[in-house]
Interface confidence: medium
């Protein structure tokens, strides 16, 4: 099916940019794996590399305003020709569930004292309002809370006394249109206009005073322009070439308004002076090598010694990576391949351990299934043997780190009924459902 | 372990109606989103419509988009397929499948038939003046 290819994927946002154009197949689309596609317009955005994991979306505001409740984040698993790590194809999104409390407490009304006594009237002539008040406490509100209705109220007073009215111009009135639209007649064009003093008009008893300055005001006509040209365009000009040497590119054709061109601001030519086709190299852009993650550490040894486990000898491990997905000669990966450190074996050896602290309350799981929980741990944590942290191995070569490697076997005094591992779980409260931002409303 | 059962498949007129069920026995039935697929005679078998655990999200593929209608009752351990204005080309043997809720959501993953970890016999409907 045809999908709209566009030049630019815009990793913060997941937004497509630089339209190139529809019509166009995605494989001719991904011949370039810097371009992007949409299946339609306003859909979700495909970039054309190999896919991987969006970055994880903000969290989604907490689902109760106040006490405990639950909220949602998402990630998309984005890109063409391939899968995203878990075997997940592209599009599908993954969920991620925690407990939140914007607000320990939830709000409580409060309740009004009496009225207090009326405040003086607001005008000393004519008529006016007063006001009083009255406070909210009680009892006072608690968490945030208020009080229903309202802290204040007014009502009309009079204080039987006339107020004097003066003057006030109404707004002028429209200038009467000049005699001509372009310059050059024999008359040189004037306009006018007038205002009234009837906004309003003085009072005579008590006397109000009467509108200051002139009732009316003219002026010439300046800067009419002379009559206007409208502009023309001319032909189009020769098609610009292909921009690019692999994949899709976009030609333009140009033209010029002036046949003839506007003058004394007669309208420009309507439409564009620009037109684009899309252009089809038919080859594939060059595709640069990308290191996947560092592969395990081997195990820690010292050659010609058949173990080094529980002792305090030093051995050395290394650990790989590979540059995957370089095509139509693209850059190699940059940096090693290879990754070299010095090492003390731990692997199995029994070591005296403690509990840890409670861990922090982990996610809920499952975050889009039913009745999820979150738990925390305590865990029996090996005291790791005091040898040196860094040897010298060979004379002039400075001190290198020594890390310690493998699984060893704490042992901790029993914790509940435990020796490595105690947990503790709580269902999560007030659970959105997991709704998919880009599907549209069925 | 899920076992799912349809049932609703038959000869219809084109312009016609018809309403597929799919039972399922097993007390976790709620905690798995449900998906219908159709397969016709020397074709690939084909996403039809799917809809998650708490029926919070239901999907369709484009064909039958404003057509067919899924719906669930978890109490009644079924899920619905409505099939309306059917065309000759919706021939095919319909089969109701179930995946395991969790992490995962979005068309494209419940479109993936590899997902689903239990399938039924699949119920024949045929399209025909």
């Known amino acids: 099916d045809p999908v709209l290819c566009f030049t630019q994927y815009e990793e913060s946002s997941g937004k497509c940019k630089g339209l190139l154009g529809g019509g166009v197949s995605v494989e001719d689309c991904c011949l370039n794996t810097a371009f992007a596609y949409q299946k339609r317009s306003g859909g979700l955005c495909q970039p054309c590399r190999s896919p991987r994991w969006s970055l994880w979306s903000t969290w989604a505001p907490c689902s109760v305003t106040c006490s405990e409740g639950s909220q949602l984040r998402y990630r998309r698993c984005v890109g063409w020709n391939g899968q995203c790590s878990g075997k997940v194809a592209p599009g599908t999104l993954e969920w991620q569930l925690q407990a939140c409390e914007d607000q320990q407490c939830c709000p409580e009304m409060g309740g009004w004292s009496g009225w207090g006594p009326w405040e003086p009237c607001s005008v000393t002539c004519s008529k006016g309002t007063r006001t009083r008040r009255r406070a909210c406490n009680h009892p006072a509100p608690k968490c945030g809370g208020h009080c229903p209705g309202q802290a204040q109220e007014s009502e009309a007073c009079d204080t039987q006394q006339v107020c004097p009215t003066h003057g006030a111009w109404a707004t002028w009135g429209p200038w009467t249109p000049c005699s001509a639209s372009c310059h050059g007649g024999p008359h040189e064009p004037k306009e006018t206009r007038s205002r009234k003093c009837s906004a309003p008009e003085p009072s005579q008893k008590p006397p109000g005073k009467p509108c200051p300055g002139l009732a009316y005001e003219q002026r010439r006509c300046t800067g009419l322009p002379p009559c206007p040209v409208a502009g023309g365009w001319g032909p189009w000009g020769p098609v610009s070439p292909c921009p690019v040497t692999c994949g899709l590119g976009q030609t333009m054709e140009q033209r010029t308004c002036n046949h003839p061109v506007p003058q004394h601001g007669g309208p420009f030519c309507a439409g564009d002076a620009t037109r684009t086709h899309i252009c089809n190299t038919a080859v594939p852009c060059p595709v640069d090598g990308e290191w996947d993650s560092w592969g395990e550490w081997s195990p820690c040894i010292r050659r010609n010694m058949k173990s080094i486990s529980c002792q305090e000898i030093p051995g050395q491990q290394s650990r790989g990576r590979t540059c995957r997905g370089r095509k139509f000669d693209g850059h190699r990966c940059a940096g090693q391949q290879q990754d070299i450190r010095h090492c003390y074996s731990i692997q199995h050896c029994p070591l005296k351990g403690s509990w840890s602290e409670w861990s922090t309350w982990g996610l809920c799981m499952p975050p889009c299934g039913p009745n999820p929980t979150r738990a925390r741990q305590r865990l029996c944590t090996p005291l790791l043997p005091k040898y040196p942290p860094t040897v010298s191995m060979v004379e002039g070569q400075g001190e290198k780190n020594v890390t310690f490697w493998g699984r060893p076997l704490p042992r901790c005094e029993e914790l509940q009924g435990q020796k490595l591992v105690v947990e503790e779980k709580r269902p999560c409260l007030h659970v959105p459902a997991c709704k998919d931002p880009e599907e549209e409303e069925l | 372990q899920v076992q799912v059962v349809e049932s609703g498949g038959g000869l219809v007129q084109p312009g016609g109606s018809l309403s597929l069920s799919c039972a399922a026995s097993?007390?976790?039935?709620?905690?798995?989103?449900m998906g219908w697929f159709r397969q016709a005679p020397g074709k690939e078998r084909e996403f039809v419509a799917a809809?998650?655990?708490?029926?919070?999200?239901?999907y369709y593929a484009d064909s039958v988009k404003g057509r067919f209608t899924l719906s669930r009752d978890n109490a009644e351990n079924t899920v619905w397929l409505q099939l309306n204005s059917l065309k000759p080309e919706d021939t095919a043997v319909y089969y109701c499948?179930?995946?395991?809720?969790?992490?995962?959501?979005?068309?494209?993953?419940?479109?993936?038939?590899?997902?689903?970890?239990?399938w039924g016999q699949g119920t024949l409907v045929t399209v025909s003046g």
């Open positions: 499948a179930a995946a395991e809720s969790g992490r995962y959501s979005g068309r494209d993953y419940y479109s993936a038939p590899g997902v689903y970890l239990y």
């Open positions: 097993g007390r976790t039935f709620s905690s798995y989103a």
């Open positions: 809809i998650t655990w708490d029926g919070a999200n239901i």
